[in-house]
């Protein structure tokens, strides 16, 4: 699902207040609900009829440093006999998410939000038929 | 997929530098890759063998203000005849994501990261069998 453009109004002070100096604002340390955890059924990437693999990307100047991307294993879906059925299609499910980018020059450290497109998993769909002239 | 605990080291300055004053840091305005967009196949939530509905939650003091949650429509999966097959199961695919929480008292505005659990869609799996004594 998509994240709307900021329009930067979200990060501005009310009009009646003095503007934010130097185009930056105060970000409090700590993360709300940091201990919240995904509670998905186990190994769904292998048990799915549209199975997927995971690739981990790592960047020490990004939070979270580890971002996991899914890739569908097949074009088709796996049927009850364990064979690929290409009358159906495995398609990626994508999600826009935010990460924090760390920028530093010596002791001057600043942070900026960054939008990242994450493929979270795959689902099996009936393909849309397009009649080409 | 899960976001690791910060341990808050990511947001700290190098040891040789003076500490961050007042437990906050500088967040630059603007979002990197803001124009990046999800490019999923259309209507996959209805075309999937594990279809889902969307619910939108709205919070003006959160960025993004709109967070969309998926809910699987069925316990089973939809077969080629359009009937629910409950020998298979529709399961949610979850993702931990970051949002920004805005806190303000008068003209004093600060921001804090918050972890949110988002159900992005559903996939069809073979259920794991547990023998109960």
């Amino acid at each position: 699902r998509k994240i709307p453009k900021v329009g930067h109004t979200f990060f501005q002070k009310p009009e009646s207040c003095p503007p934010v100096p130097g185009g930056s604002m105060k970000l409090d340390i700590g993360i709300i609900n940091e201990n919240q955890r995904v509670s998905m059924s186990r190994n769904i990437e292998s048990r799915s009829t549209s199975p997927w693999n995971y690739t981990v990307t790592w960047d020490p100047n990004r939070y979270p440093s580890e971002v996991v991307q899914a890739q569908c294993r097949n074009l088709g879906c796996i049927n009850a006999q364990g064979k690929e059925d290409i009358s159906m299609n495995s398609v990626p499910i994508q999600q826009e998410t935010l990460v924090v980018r760390r920028k530093h020059q010596g002791c001057s450290v600043s942070f900026q939000l960054e939008k990242v497109l994450v493929t979270v998993g795959c689902t099996c769909v009936t393909p849309v038929i397009h009649h080409v002239q | 997929r899960k976001i690791p605990k910060v341990g808050h080291t990511f947001f700290q300055k190098p040891e040789s530098c003076p500490p961050v004053p007042g437990g906050s840091m500088k967040l630059d305005i603007g979002i990197i890759n803001e124009n990046q967009r999800v490019s999923m196949s259309r209507n996959i939530e209805s075309r999937s063998t594990s279809p889902w509905n969307y619910t939108v939650t709205w919070d003006p003091n959160r960025y993004p203000s709109e967070v969309v949650q998926a809910q699987c429509r069925n316990l089973g999966c939809i077969n080629a005849q359009g009937k629910e097959d409950i020998s298979m199961n529709s399961v949610p695919i979850q993702q931990e994501t970051l949002v920004v929480r805005r806190k303000h008292q008068g003209c004093s505005v600060s921001f804090q990261l918050e972890k949110v659990l988002v159900t992005v869609g559903c996939t069809c799996v073979t259920p794991v069998i547990h023998h109960v004594q």
Epitope: S41, R42, I44, R47 | C72, N74, L75, E84, I86, N89, S90, V91, P92, V125, P127, V128, I129, H130, V132
Partner: nanobody, 116 residues
Framework: QVQLVQSGGGLVQTGGSLRLSCSVS????????MGWYRQVPGRQRELVAM????????YYADSVKDRFTISRINANNTIHLQMNNLKPEDTAIYYC?????????MGQGTQVTVSS
């Protein structure tokens, strides 16, 4: 943790009736179902009947339609399988099951034998 307690079963003649019962306790979500699978040694497990715990929708194998009826008593999460006009091919071990999305919990099994 899910617990299943099943009862019923036994020996019956062709054309006779039996009733199986099963109760479930533990963590039960709104999107779940209860029912029975059966298995004949050396053959694949077969879904016999299921009932959705909140919607009440029922599902039957084609081989038992119009002969078997699944019902649920909401108050104590108990289900019953009324089996009428039994045939020798219904002979199997019947397993009570509770299905949470992605996880199928199976009871200890009860033998049903239909003699000709």
């Amino acid at each position: 943790q899910v617990q299943l307690v099943q009862s019923g079963g036994g020996l019956v003649q062709t054309g006779g009736s039996l009733r199986l019962s099963c109760s479930v306790s533990g963590d039960i979500s709104s999107q779940s179902a209860m029912g029975w699978y059966r298995q004949v040694p050396g053959r694949q497990r077969e879904l016999v009947a299921m009932i959705h715990t909140t919607k009440g929708d029922t599902y039957y194998a084609d081989s038992v339609k119009d002969r078997f009826t699944i019902s649920r008593i909401n108050a104590n999460n108990t289900i019953h399988l009324q089996m009428n006009n039994l045939k020798p091919e219904d002979t199997a071990i019947y397993y009570c099951t509770h299905n949470e999305p992605g996880d199928l919990y199976m009871g200890q099994g009860t033998q049903v034998t239909v003699s000709s």
